[in-house]
Interface confidence: medium
């Protein structure tokens, strides 16, 4: 009864502050929450990560842990503090009875508590054949010192550091935090214990079969000889990396997490903190032929999450399972029959498969890119990985139907050269989680902290939606989509771009009384239109006649249905220029597309008119896709007429800057 659709379980236990008469009672009305893995077999009851509020100091963490022990002892319970976290997340790891959870949730400073759970290596360990190392392929871009300025941390099993592929390239740290192996008949065998980590180290930086042959690596042991670890052990490993970074700042850091467990709020939070400290994290999407959003660290937005494809660009099937998919995957990479170092002997090679291998590929590519451009931020690196990927080569029929539109059709590739990408305006598409079906349900899509939201669209499989709008949240714009009565739910789709020194704002026009439709334009000097959104309160937008027409010579204008409010995203940035491109089809069609030409980047994608038979609009790479209801269910021809509206932008400033560098 594995709950494949199972949302992460959250048990909210109410605080009863009168008990124990706490000296530092929590703020009135706040509730600390308890979380645990949705997959029962992966749960580790009896060990809990107590996460404290963000500004909690180490001394307060220690005091809170001692208080828990004292109060537990008064009730006759033994507890053991296994670790006090600081540097990444404030909190502590405690071994205790689940009976004490209610007590622990009432302690001061407690934000939430998570039961520990298992994480697993994401390679398939069987049917491994002995094979010879691959021949050097001349057509591949392989600089001899690729990745030499970058340090890659590998959190995995132990490794065979004297293997010829990785000897002198991997430093084995003294970090080890692994659970006992399962089963009484288990015998540790060095070659088996080292198998997963050795192979991945070889894929990242191996002499013969490595992607980034110049990268140096450091290994931390968080997976045991059976490829199993814990969320808590992984957290302590990430904290170790952060402390190492603070003690001895080096060049760019890449952290490879070739493991997966159930959705974990605390593991995702730790990844977020490390990413915001400037570390690039790359993880396996998971091998469960499932939505990657149900797993961690794959579901952490700040992490680069990698699915696996084979040599034919098909998603990898692994026995009865296969690569994970969905909106939490950033891109795919080779992950089937990948040749790498075998721990059977110091010159042995072996083929392994899985999203671990795919993630190792991307970690190697990231190391190469960062070595060429050490100042790249995480957002810039992610955008470049997406930009240089092979587009639309994956056979999407392998994915469940409802996941196809959400799953990126991107296979990672090395850039043709490590320079010359600076002039490009980079954008990516970010899908929200599904809103759920309730009438007032909304879905929110967010960009990364150093990306600009240039447009916002929405999509509903049933077509019942009330559009979308850009709104400010915590000082940043977000994209919010609205479900309609009787709808099965909506997605919000954000177009997130790298636009240095940008100043963007949203201009709104309320529904027009006149029959000509609603219009809004960018009226500030120097501001250009990057995206149009429309939102309506009525349950069903009727047909809009006469059709909405954009007046000639007014490209900086959004137009829409007269019953909808229209929102224009207007940006000012050095050298930014944009143009509107439309593709209208008079007869009903399930899909209408319009693409930006070479040198221009799609920033906005919307549909005209916004009538109810339009399911929504979204960007796929540089193409704007507008989807409509099945033509057989659409009424008249005029009702079926749909126009896809793309806004294409480029930055002359970025182009100039890159030319000056050449």
């Amino acid at each position: 009864q594995e709950d494949e659709d199972g949302d992460y379980e959250e048990l909210v236990l109410a605080l009863r502050s009168e008990e124990d008469g706490l000296a530092e009672a929590p703020e009135h009305g706040t509730t600390a929450t308890f979380h645990r893995c949705a997959k029962d077999p992966w749960r580790l009851p009896g060990t809990y990560v107590v996460v404290l509020k963000e500004e909690t100091h180490l001394s307060q963490s220690e005091r809170t842990a001692r208080r828990l022990q004292a109060q537990a002892a008064r009730r006759g319970y033994l507890t053991k503090i296994l670790h006090v976290f600081h540097g990444l997340l404030p909190g502590f790891l405690v071994k205790m009875s689940g009976d004490l959870l209610e007590l622990a949730l009432k302690l001061p400073h407690v934000d939430y508590i998570e039961e520990d759970s298992s994480v697993f290596a994401q390679s398939i360990p069987w049917n491994l054949e002995r094979i010879t190392p691959p021949r050097y392929r001349a057509d591949e871009y392989q600089p001899p010192d690729g990745g030499s300025l970058v340090e890659v941390y590998l959190l995995d099993t132990s490794i065979q550091s004297d293997h010829r592929e990785i000897e002198g390239r991997v430093m084995v740290t003294d970090f080890e935090n692994v659970p006992e192996e399962d089963g009484t008949r288990f015998h540790r065998q060095a070659s088996k214990c080292d198998s997963h980590g050795t192979h991945l180290a070889g894929v990242v930086s191996g002499r013969d079969a490595g992607v980034a042959k110049g990268a140096s690596m450091r290994s931390l042991r968080v997976l045991n000889c059976q490829g199993k670890g814990t969320v808590s052990g992984t957290l302590i490993g990430l904290e170790f990396i952060r402390k190492s970074q603070l003690v001895q700042p080096v060049g760019p850091l890449v952290v490879l997490l070739p493991l997966a467990g159930g959705y974990s709020r605390v593991l995702n939070a730790a990844c977020q903190r490390l990413a915001r400290a400037g570390v690039v994290l790359v993880t396996a999407a998971g091998n469960f032929r499932d939505d990657a959003c149900l797993y961690s660290p794959a579901s952490a937005p700040e992490v680069i999450t990698v699915g696996a494809t084979n040599a034919q660009d098909q998603p990898v099937t692994l026995g009865t399972l296969g690569t994970n998919f969905g909106r939490c995957v950033d891109l795919f990479a080779p992950g089937e029959d990948i040749i790498g170092a075998s721990s059977d002997c110091s010159t042995c090679f072996v083929s392994q498969s899985g999203t671990s291998q795919a993630a190792a590929h991307v970690a190697g590519i990231a190391a190469m890119m960062l070595s060429a451009e050490p100042e790249l931020t995480l957002a810039e690196l992610r955008q470049r990985l997406i930009h240089f990927s092979a587009k639309d080569v994956i056979n999407e029929a392998w994915f469940p139907e409802d996941q196809r539109v959400l799953t990126p059709n991107l296979v990672a590739a090395l850039p043709p050269s490590t320079h010359g990408a600076g002039w490009q305006l980079f954008c990516r598409t970010v899908w929200s989680a599904h809103s759920g079906p309730t009438r007032m349900a909304t879905a929110v899509a967010r960009c990364a902290p150093d990306e600009e939201l240039l447009s916002c669209s929405s999509f509903s499989r049933s077509g019942k939606r009330r559009g979308e709008r850009m709104e400010a949240q915590g000082g940043k714009l977000v994209c919010r989509a609205h479900n309609a009565f009787g709808g099965e739910g909506v997605y919000a789709i954000a177009r997130c771009c790298l636009l240095p020194q940008a100043n963007c704002s949203v201009h709104t026009a309320p529904p027009a009384e006149a029959s000509m439709g609603t219009r809004v334009h960018c009226h500030q000097q120097g501001h250009v239109l990057t995206g149009c959104s429309s939102h309506w309160e009525v349950e069903d937008l009727g047909t809009h006649k006469p059709p909405v027409l954009r007046p000639r010579g007014q490209p900086n204008q959004c137009v829409g249905h007269r019953e909808a409010s229209i929102h224009a995203s207007c940006c000012h940035a050095p050298g930014l220029e944009c143009k509107v491109k439309e593709h209208g089809i008079p007869a009903p069609q399930e899909q209408v597309t319009v693409a930006c030409e070479e040198g221009w980047t799609l920033t906005g994608c919307s549909a005209l008119p916004g009538t109810s038979h339009v399911l929504g609009a979204y960007a796929v790479d540089n193409t704007c896709v507008v989807r409509s209801r099945d033509v057989s269910t659409t009424g008249s021809t005029s009702e079926g007429a749909v126009t896809a509206v793309a806004i294409c932008c480029r930055s002359r400033h970025l182009a100039q800057a890159s030319q000056e560098l050449q």
Partner: antibody
Framework: QEQLVESGGGLVQPEGSLTLTCTAS?????????MCWVRQAPGKGLEWIGC???????TYYASWAKGRFTISKPSSTTVTLQMTRLTAADTATYFC???????????????????WGPGTLVTVSS | DIVMTQTPASVSEPVGGTVTINCQAS??????LSWYQQKPGQRPKLLIY???TLASGVPSRFKGSGSGTDFTLTISDLECADAATYYC??????????????FGGGTEVVVK
């Protein structure tokens, strides 16, 4: 030795109610198990009724069983099946089964009923 | 509702022969399929889990295969002791999907 024993079966009037109990020995319920009820009408096939998670007590039922059948876990070694508004079509041998998970790859697992009770016969008749 | 359909309802084969039983799910259940053997008046016994893995103590004459929607149980070198009714069962995501019955209708194997 691990075993399950069902009790509480017998003759019951139509529209009546009955509670069956499944008692485990040789093991106690942990979050690793689901305890399930399956029935078999005379001369017919097996019919899944539902399961309860021994970890958090969440219950799952066959679509036809929702509303009339309730599974609960009164202790760490007993599971009950409460049946209401019984009809002649509910006449069957009722089995209690333990669903445990089997791991077959890194983190991947499936469930199967590895331990069954001998069954208890419920006859609905006036 | 997920429905499990088992064919044939009955099959008769001589000792030493081979029997093939099919089980079809109305939608994909990955490899979440088990096979059980039940002799008259007895409780069911687990033979195979995960579509293809033999349960402890089950002879290798029993072989399970398939994934997704189509599954097969093959019994080779039939013995008299194999005379029983065989059931397939899926428990794929019961918490989030609706089942009429997790079991197939059963296949009676007669050994001549």
């Amino acid at each position: 030795q691990e075993q399950l024993v069902e009790s509480g079966g017998g003759l019951v009037q139509p529209e009546g109610s009955l509670t069956l109990t499944c008692t485990a020995s040789g093991f106690s319920f942990t979050s690793d198990y689901y305890m399930c009820w399956v029935r078999q009408a005379p001369g017919k096939g097996l019919e899944w009724i539902g399961c309860i998670s021994t970890g958090d007590g969440s219950t799952y039922y066959a679509s036809w069983a929702k509303g009339r059948f309730t599974i609960s876990k009164p202790s760490s070694t007993t599971v009950t099946l409460q049946m209401t508004r019984l009809t002649a079509a509910d006449t069957a041998t009722y089995f209690c089964a333990r669903d445990r998970y089997y791991s077959y790859a890194y983190g991947a697992y499936v469930y199967a009923s590895d331990l069954w009770g001998p069954g208890t016969l419920v006859t609905v008749s006036s | 509702d997920i429905v499990m359909t088992q064919t044939p309802a009955s099959v008769s084969e001589p000792v030493g022969g081979t029997v093939t039983i099919n089980c079809q799910a109305s939608e994909s259940i990955r490899n979440y399929l088990s096979w059980y053997q039940q002799k008259p008046g007895q409780r069911p016994k687990l033979l195979i889990y995960g579509a293809s893995t033999l349960a402890s103590g089950v002879p290798s004459r029993f072989k399970g295969s398939g994934s997704g929607t189509d599954f097969t149980l093959t019994i080779s070198d039939l013995e008299c002791a194999d005379a029983a009714t065989y059931y397939c069962q899926s428990n794929y995501g019961i918490s989030s999907r609706s089942y009429v019955n997790g079991f197939g209708g059963g296949t009676e194997v007669v050994v001549k």
